[in-house]
């Protein structure tokens, strides 16, 4: 006869490990007992369990409540046991010793490998600002056994660097993603991808990039100066900019206070029916936590009567 077992049994932390040991005997051979022990190098054998043909299952005190026989139906030549709720400390070498009649004793060894799936964590780097050089966007750390793989999935251009720390029964891997911040990266996803044999599928943690910036300010509304004449209604100036975080707007008049009746509505300055007193230099102040910008325009309100008089003069002069 001969013993059938596995060289390596792999199980995920917390799962039950089946330690196989099957005696393939000749006709008429009987198994008297199967003794299981842990036999790590450099340490004495530690008894695990005894499967006895007459007495049944005995579990040694150190493994009380954690070793069982596989559920029925059972073959009397099958000395396999279940190690419940595998923990990292269970990883190691195990031996089954089978006492048979009349063939004698047989033994076989297997290695139990306990996979510890990682629980990854993603830590954003310092605040990203346009104009910075190469900056840490995020770091991702995952610890497991064996060492997990940590990669990045993103459309953003950047560089990665990884380092690994070995512990007694596991390894921690940290990967950093560096980039040169630009406003085009704003809102883009940066995904840490962790792979490990103990995971059914890759674990993904996504971080949305936020890059602080403030665009140059400009004012719209004066494209056609002829529209800015006395009596015109609905005239307005709009301040144009964009930023992250979104900017706030403030309007002032350089050559005095804002005329009465002029309404400030965020980025928009609304005028009542125009009069000559609305002429002046207007300044739009745009600011966010990152920066501030100014843009100024000169409003010159035309008097249509003056204009028509001049035209008449011109005509008569001709």
């Amino acid at each position: 006869g001969e013993l059938e077992t596995s060289d390596v049994v792999t199980v995920v932390l917390g799962q039950d490990a089946k330690l196989p040991c099957f005696y393939r005997g000749d006709s008429g051979e009987q198994v008297g007992q199967v003794a299981w022990a842990r036999v790590d190098a450099g340490e004495g054998a530690q008894e695990l369990a005894l499967l006895h043909s007459k007495y049944g299952l005995h579990v040694s005190p150190a493994y009380e409540g954690r070793v069982e026989q596989p559920p029925p139906p059972r073959n009397p030549l099958d000395g396999s046991v279940l190690l419940r709720n595998a923990v990292q400390a269970d990883e190691g070498e195990y031996e089954c010793r089978v006492s048979t009649f009349p063939a004698g004793s047989f033994q076989a060894r297997l290695r139990l490998r306990v996979l510890v799936p990682p629980l990854p964590s993603l830590n954003p780097g310092p605040a990203l600002e346009e104009g910075q050089g190469l900056t840490l966007a995020a770091s991702c750390t995952a610890e497991g056994s064996p060492a997990p793989s940590v990669t990045w999935d993103t459309e953003v251009k950047g560089t990665t660097s990884s380092r690994s720390f070995k512990h007694s029964r596991s390894a921690a891997v940290t990967s950093e993603f560096h980039l040169v911040p630009s406003r085009s990266m704003n809102g883009q996803p940066l995904t840490c991808v962790v792979s490990h044999p103990g995971l059914l599928q890759d674990q993904r943690i996504t971080h949305i990039l936020h890059v602080s910036f403030l665009a140059e300010a400009s004012v719209r509304g004066l494209e056609d100066q002829n529209l800015w004449h006395i009596g015109r209604e609905g005239a307005m100036l709009k301040c144009l900019s964009e930023g992250q975080p979104p900017p706030s707007y403030n309007w002032t008049r350089l050559d005095g206070p804002l005329p009465s009746g002029v309404r400030v509505d965020g980025d928009t300055l609304g005028f009542p029916p125009l009069t000559t007193e609305h002429s002046g230099i207007y300044v739009c102040h745009v600011s966010n936590e990152f920066s501030s910008r100014d843009s100024q325009v000169t409003v010159d309100v035309l008097d249509p009567q003056e204009d028509s008089g001049k035209q008449v003069d011109l005509v008569s002069a001709s």
Epitope: Y55, H58, S105
Partner: antibody, heavy 126, light 107 residues
Framework: EVQLVESGGGLVQPGGSLRLSCAAS????????MSWVRQAPGKGLEWVSG????????RYADSVKGRFTISRDNSKNTLYLQMNSLRAEDTAVYYC???????????????????WGQGTLVTVSS | DIQMTQSPSSLSASVGDRVTITCRAS??????LAWYQQKPGKAPKLLIY???SLQSGVPSRFSGSGSGTDFTLTISSLQPEDFATYYC?????????FGQGTKVEIK
């Protein structure tokens, strides 16, 4: 025929010592684990100590731990129990017994006691 | 330690009676249980091992059953030589422990 013969019992004062012997014959002594079991007058059976075949693994009941020592001399087919610091509650008939040999090389369990000696009486009294 | 509780502690029966003695372990012991018979002034004698296996030379009127925590010794037809004290013993853990005994007396 398997025979186990105990000797060494007797009257001893509290705090005293005795050494019990058990001579085995009629079987291969080296192949069997052995135990000592005692029975106080009018009481039940109490396992005292046991030793595996090679003599390397000795176990004791809590009530005698640190005071009694079990040993064996396989060349003389003899089992011993050295009893020190004896107390009145150690008064009993002490039996040596052979353990049934159907569990191989597994120290965590003992086996049934298939042969017993006739017993030797130990009396601890002042 | 595992506690072994026998019942009854004594019983009176007549020759030819069927006698049942029970033994309960304080925790599961698979079939690591033996039964012994002891007569006054004599050493105990192994009757049953592995809960139900009859020791060589023991009459077939003795039988054992059970596993886990509950066990039974049955004498199918009591004979005059069977009047004695009976002990159960677990050997699942060290120390092995005995029941307190059941004395079978003549009615």
């Amino acid at each position: 025929e398997v025979q186990l013969v105990e000797s060494g019992g007797g009257l001893v004062q509290p705090g005293g010592s005795l050494r019990l012997s058990c001579a085995a014959s009629g079987y291969n002594f080296t192949s069997y684990d052995m135990s000592w079991v005692r029975q106080a007058p009018g009481k039940g059976l109490e396992w005292v100590s046991g030793i595996k075949t090679g003599g390397g693994s000795a176990r004791y009941a809590d009530s005698v731990k640190g005071r009694f020592t079990i040993s064996r001399d396989n060349s003389k087919n003899t089992l011993y129990l050295q009893m020190n610091s004896l107390r009145a509650e150690d008064t009993a008939v002490y039996y040596c017994a052979r353990e049934y040999s159907d569990v191989v090389d597994y120290v965590s369990v003992r086996t049934p006691l298939d042969y017993w000696g006739q017993g030797t009486l130990v009396t601890v009294s002042s | 330690d595992i506690q072994m509780t026998q019942s009854p502690s004594s019983l009176s029966a007549s020759v030819g009676d069927r006698v049942t003695i029970t033994c309960r372990a304080s925790q599961g012991i698979s079939s690591y249980l033996a039964w012994y018979q002891q007569k006054p002034g004599k050493a105990p004698k192994l009757l049953i091992y592995a809960a139900s296996s009859l020791q060589s030379g023991v009459p077939s009127r003795f039988s054992g059953s059970g596993s886990g925590t509950d066990f039974t010794l049955t004498i199918s037809s009591l004979q005059p030589e069977d009047f004695a004290t009976y002990y159960c013993q677990q050997h699942y853990t060290t120390p092995p422990t005995f029941g307190q005994g059941t004395k079978v007396e003549i009615k």
